[in-house]
């Protein structure tokens, strides 16, 4: 039985301030059942960046078509990047439950922000 893999192919991404950053994440299977969420940072103090069902994330959009069937691409795009957005972003798979239980995290993608070219 192959174990679910959460793949963040880029270890780091560098973006100019004001531009958009694309953070890539794919999974190897549609199961176990449960959502994907994105966080900045690790551990108990991590910041939720994107969760489709709950919250309002005006600067974050999924890269793939939200009506695409059997989607395994959970990449996101963050618009209007500022230096405050720098950090390591994790794509995390949860197992459905009450509450959902964290199952596996990607290796993380470090986002660095360059000064806007003059």
């Amino acid at each position: 039985e192959e174990e679910l893999q959460v793949i963040q192919p880029e270890k780091s991404v560098s973006v100019a301030a004001g531009d958009s950053a694309t953070l890539n994440c794919t999974v190897s299977s549609l199961i176990p059942v449960g959502p994907i969420q994105w966080f900045r940072g690790a551990g108990p103090g991590r910041e939720l960046i994107y969760n489709l069902k709950e919250g309002h994330f005006p600067r974050v959009t999924p890269v793939s078509d939200p009506t695409k069937r059997n989607n395994m691409d959970f990449s996101i795009r963050i618009s209007n990047i500022t230096p405050a957005d720098a950090g390591t972003y994790y794509c995390v798979k949860f197992r459905k439950g009450s509450p959902d239980v964290e199952l596996k995290s990607g290796a993380g993608t470090e986002l660095s922000v360059r000064a806007k070219p003059s």
Epitope: L30, P32, G34, P62, T67, R69, N70, F74
Partner: antibody
């Protein structure tokens, strides 16, 4: 072409057991969640159970009595039904789950169903 | 548990007519609604998912709309093969997945 073929239905006395099987073909069985949905005679559809990998989910009406399982090497889904009651009488459908976007599951392919009758 | 209420329970329609089915959820389900058609003696068939996306091979006379708690399935011009029972299903909050009670379409 996706195919789901159920078997194992029949007549059983109250308190008895049955094991339903669903043979799947035409898709990568091991990466999809699978479900059982039933329909009592002349009634609507009722979700029974879903299995992901080793994660399982049940309707309250069958929890503790029914067990869903799968054998990915055989592309087969199972439903072990114990302590059967008259109200479990229904056509049992095997269904392939489909996900959309980042969201939940619905059922994009269904088998033809197998009839389970619980009667003394 | 989210309750789905379909109305009307039965519709008597002539071929060629426009038909509208309603599905109301007891709480917000965003756009996480699917519609199925079931003909007598047959398994259900997926028509619409994500409230408005037609499944592969479904004729364009079938369309879905709505979000939140109120959803509609429309058949723009009913064909003889469209008679049967239509069910909505929510997959926003589960378990359990829940289905509406169905709307039966009969020949007038």
């Amino acid at each position: 072409e996706v195919q789901l073929v159920e078997s194992g239905g029949g007549v059983v006395q109250p308190g008895g057991s049955l094991r339903l099987s669903c043979a799947a073909s035409g898709f990568s069985f091991s990466i999809y969640a699978m479900s059982w949905v039933r329909q009592a005679p002349g009634k609507g559809l009722e979700w029974v159970s879903t299995i992901g990998a080793d994660d399982t989910y049940y309707a309250d009406s069958v929890k503790g009595r029914f067990t869903i399982s799968r054998d990915n090497s055989k592309n087969t889904l199972y439903l072990q039904m114990n302590s059967l009651r008259a109200e479990d009488t229904a056509v049992y459908y095997c269904a392939k789950d489909s996900t959309v976007g980042w969201s939940g599951d619905f059922f994009d392919y269904w088998g033809q169903g197998t009839l389970v009758t619980v009667s003394s | 548990e989210i309750v789905l209420t379909q109305s009307p329970a039965t519709l008597s329609v002539s071929p060629g007519e426009r038909v509208t089915f309603s599905c109301r959820a007891s709480q917000n389900v965003r756009s996480d609604i699917a519609w199925y058609q079931q003909k007598p003696g047959q398994a259900p068939r997926l028509l619409i998912y994500a409230a408005s996306s037609r499944d592969t091979g479904i004729p364009d006379r079938f369309s879905g709309s709505g979000s939140g708690t109120d959803f509609t399935l429309t058949i723009s011009s009913l064909q003889s093969e469209d008679f049967g029972v239509y069910y909505c299903q929510q997959y926003y909050d589960w378990p359990p997945f829940t289905f509406g009670g169905g709307t039966k379409v009969e020949i007038k």
